[in-house]
Interface confidence: medium
């Protein structure tokens, strides 16, 4: 039950995270800029990965796409790539995890197959989340290191006045959405990986059967039998005998006096 809950919660958290990554990638407000100290008009400029927009106090808003690929900064291209890779991996991870969900029965799919699929989707979610966090962080770093600060081109005019005006860029809403979404996808992926451990069939230590050819009789102690899984009390593997290939539950439910060699 706990495994199913962990897997289901991991799926939901990852789903929300990937939806957030998609939203952040599509959002226009990656960096925002106020034309501060500029009496021309109250204008709010903001830029995304795909286009730039201007919103005026009058309510007029206009956006223009970046129609060039080659002319764009390499860092912007890198951020775009990271976000797209994150979305693609996340989408594939969601698709795989749907079939891996314990609550969904598809034919006669074994638990081991579901465990592998859960692990695969978990790893995909982790990588997806890391891609999104990396992309957003690279962009944020560009803002912090003044890469996106505009140094005005002011020509020496009749007055002989030359000035440099810097345009301040701040973090846009998309950065925070991206960070949170990336984190959620990462957490969801970790939860899926944890769920995978619970889904995998436990390896019982049936191979540790000790055969004695000598005449020494070994007495069977009722109640002392347990198939060693690493979780039982018999962790030192001291003389565990099993005459038949039964599950741990079967052995504990129906102890037999013939369980010795």
């Amino acid at each position: 039950m706990a495994v199913t809950a962990c897997q289901g919660l991991g799926f939901v958290v990852s789903l929300i995270g990937i939806a957030g990554i998609i939203a952040a990638t599509c959002m226009d407000q990656w960096s925002t800029q106020d034309l501060y100290n500029n009496p021309v008009t109250a204008v709010f400029n903001y830029q995304g990965l795909w286009r730039s927009c201007v919103r005026e106090s009058s309510g007029f808003t206009e956006c223009r796409g970046y129609f060039t690929l080659l002319g764009l900064p390499a860092m912007l291209q890198a951020v775009r790539a990271l976000m797209i890779v994150g979305i693609v991996l996340g989408a594939i991870g969601l698709l795989v995890s749907i079939f891996a969900l314990k609550c969904i029965r598809i034919g006669s799919m074994e638990d081991s197959a579901k465990a592998n699929m859960t692990l695969t989707s978990g790893i995909m979610f982790i990588v997806s989340g890391l891609c999104a966090i990396a992309g957003v962080s690279v962009f944020a770093n560009m803002l912090v290191t003044n890469f996106w600060m505009s140094t005005a081109n002011m020509y020496t005019g009749m007055g002989g006045m030359v000035q440099t005006v810097q345009t301040r860029y701040t973090f846009g809403a998309a950065l925070f959405v991206g960070w949170v979404a990336g984190g959620l996808t990462l957490i969801g992926g970790v939860m899926m990986c944890i769920a995978c451990r619970g889904l995998a069939p436990e390896e019982t230590n049936y191979k540790a059967v000790s055969y004695h050819a000598s005449g020494h009789s070994v007495a069977y102690k009722p109640g002392g039998f347990k198939a060693s899984t690493g979780f039982g009390s018999n962790t030192k593997n001291k003389k565990i005998y099993d005459g038949g290939a039964r599950t741990e539950d079967e052995v504990q439910s129906y102890p037999s006096k013939h369980d010795y060699v």
Epitope: Q33, L35, V40, Q47, S52, E62, G71, S150, T167
Partner: nanobody, 121 residues
Framework: QVQLVESGGGLVQPGGSLRLSCAAS????????MGWYRQAPGKQREFVAG???????NYAHSVKERFTISRDNAKNTMYLQMNSLKSEDTAGYYC???????????????WGQGTLVTVSS
């Protein structure tokens, strides 16, 4: 690179009118806000009037009711119609624009070389 070229300046009598033009040329992707500034000899450069891409306008108190700013987005040109000119309007008039540069993904604040307006009898 975006260049701004002002024209229309000259000598005019007090009470007269002038129309200044500012044309943007070069690698223009988008020019958002445009404005006029002036600088009288020995004084600081001051804001005169401004217009946004959407047509929102703003004026300095000293020129309100007398000056009118307009813009033709298709031609990337801005105009300043100056009426009822006074001697204190004598100055170099500079064109200013916020131009979006897609190559660097940033705004460039561009200034023109200026045009001289002299109001004298």
């Amino acid at each position: 690179q975006v260049q701004l070229v002002e024209s229309g300046g000259g000598l005019v009598q007090p009470g007269g009118s002038l129309r200044l033009s500012c044309a943007a040329s070069g690698n223009i992707f988008r020019i958002d806000t445009m404005g006029w500034y002036r600088q009288a000899p020995g004084k600081q450069r001051e804001f005169v009037a401004g217009i946004s891409r959407g047509g929102s306008t703003n004026y300095a108190h000293s020129v309100k009711e007398r000056f009118t700013i307009s813009r033709d987005n298709a031609k990337n040109t801005m105009y300043l119609q100056m009426n009822s000119l006074k001697s204190e309007d004598t100055a170099g008039y500079y064109c200013n624009a916020q131009a979006w540069d897609p190559g660097t993904i940033r705004y460039l604040e561009v200034w023109g070389q200026g045009t001289l307006v002299t109001v004298s009898s």
